[in-house]
Interface confidence: low
């Protein structure tokens, strides 16, 4: 039975040209995390694999940085980066857990970050 839950940064906003950290946290399970995928709609952004480490998709290499932890840092944000992001935890033996984050990239300087996880 899948007992785990995923906590995410929820709905967040950031300024155009800036950076944002996407973070998810899997709790309430003893399952082993074998891999975490970060995806935007149907595009794969990055993977953190327990054996092979981080892999950033070639088309995002210049704007995506691994970490902190199992999170993902998006840099040089554009308005086109607005949308849904998913963290997909592949675990053994539980199976797959998915978390959702909605990012809004704003033109102005009034962007507020979500309360759960903040960029220092």
């Amino acid at each position: 039975m899948m007992t785990g839950t995923i906590e995410t940064t929820g709905n967040i906003s950031a300024e155009k040209g800036g950076s944002i950290i996407l973070q998810c946290h899997l709790s309430s399970t003893t399952a082993q995390v074998t891999q975490v995928n970060w995806e935007q709609q149907d595009q794969l952004l990055a993977i953190c694999n327990a054996d092979l480490g981080w892999h950033i998709s070639p088309s995002f290499k210049d704007r995506v940085a691994p970490g902190p932890g199992l999170g993902l840092t998006l840099q040089s944000l554009t308005v086109n980066d607005t949308g849904e992001y998913f963290c997909i935890y592949h675990t053994y033996p539980d199976g797959t857990y998915t978390g959702r984050i909605f990012l809004e990239v704003l033109e102005s300087s009034v962007a507020e970050h979500g309360a759960r996880f903040q960029i220092p």
Epitope: Q35, L44, H55
Partner: antibody, heavy 121, light 111 residues
Framework: EVQLVETGGGLIQPGRSLRLSCAAS????????MHWVRQAPGKGLEWVAV????????YYADSVKGRFTISRDNSKNTLYLQMNSLRAEDTAVYYC??????????????WGQGTTVTVSS | QSALTQPRSASGNPGQRVTISCSGS????????VNWYQQIPGTAPKLLIY???QRPSGVPDRFSGSQSGTSASLTISGLQSEDEAEYFC???????????LGGGTQLAVLG
């Protein structure tokens, strides 16, 4: 509909080369690792090779290492298997298959219908 | 010689329960979840069980998997004639960096 279609099989003489192709459709090909698996006549399944979603990580079965090369062209949604120095024991139906994950080799969740390679003089 | 060991054959009557075993080693089954594939003669294999005990959509709940230590098993309850096929277990080997496949078990449905 998620689909894999293999082509390129045929009758070939020992020592020659052959390239198999696998055309993918119905899913985001560039997000998945891909495998080649073969099955000799009347025998079980034998894993041949795997390639990661972006093509930078590849692993091979000992029986084909140094002779076969797995590659992919994500812009064409196509997987390849270049087979050199073919031997009679390479005679088999060759299947391409999708891995549910991009890097962590879990297994194969979608299979093609297979293409037959016969190595004989 | 396969790195994963399966019985060559198994059989049962319609409605019966049949279990197929698969044994491996600490470098594969001791570290990774096993998958099971079904192959009906003349057709491509089909994923039956993944991540030890998960069923893809469309696979009847008559099929179940379990795994403990370096061995795994596939159980088919309420056997049906269409279950007559060959069954393969498979697991990624972390040490050799290869996908190991069992030799296959031919299941015959009697009667």
């Amino acid at each position: 509909e998620v689909q894999l279609v293999e082509t390129g099989g045929g009758l070939i003489q020992p020592g020659r080369s052959l390239r198999l192709s696998c055309a993918a459709s119905g899913f985001t090909f560039s997000s998945y690792a891909m495998h080649w698996v073969r099955q000799a006549p009347g025998k079980g399944l034998e894993w041949v090779a795997v390639i990661s979603y972006a093509g930078e990580v590849k692993y091979y079965a000992d029986s084909v290492k140094g002779r076969f090369t797995i590659s992919r062209d994500n812009s064409k949604n196509t997987l390849y298997l270049q087979m050199n120095s073919l031997r009679a024991e390479d005679t088999a139906v060759y299947y391409c298959a999708r891995d549910p994950l991009p890097l962590h080799y879990y297994g194969m969740d979608v299979w093609g219908q297979g293409t037959t390679v016969t190595v004989s003089s | 010689q396969s790195a994963l060991t399966q019985p060559r054959s198994a059989s049962g009557n319609p409605g019966q329960r049949v279990t197929i075993s698969c044994s491996g080693s600490s470098s594969n089954m001791g570290r990774r979840p096993v998958n099971w594939y079904q192959q009906i003669p003349g057709t491509a294999p089909k994923l039956l069980i993944y991540s030890q005990n998960q069923r893809p959509s469309g696979v009847p709940d008559r099929f179940s998997g379990s795994q403990s230590g370096t061995s795994a098993s596939l159980t088919i309850s309420g056997l049906q004639s269409e279950d007559e096929a060959e069954y393969f277990c498979a697991v990624w080997d972390d040490i050799g960096r290869v996908l190991q496949l069992g030799g296959g078990t031919q299941l015959a449905v009697l009667g």
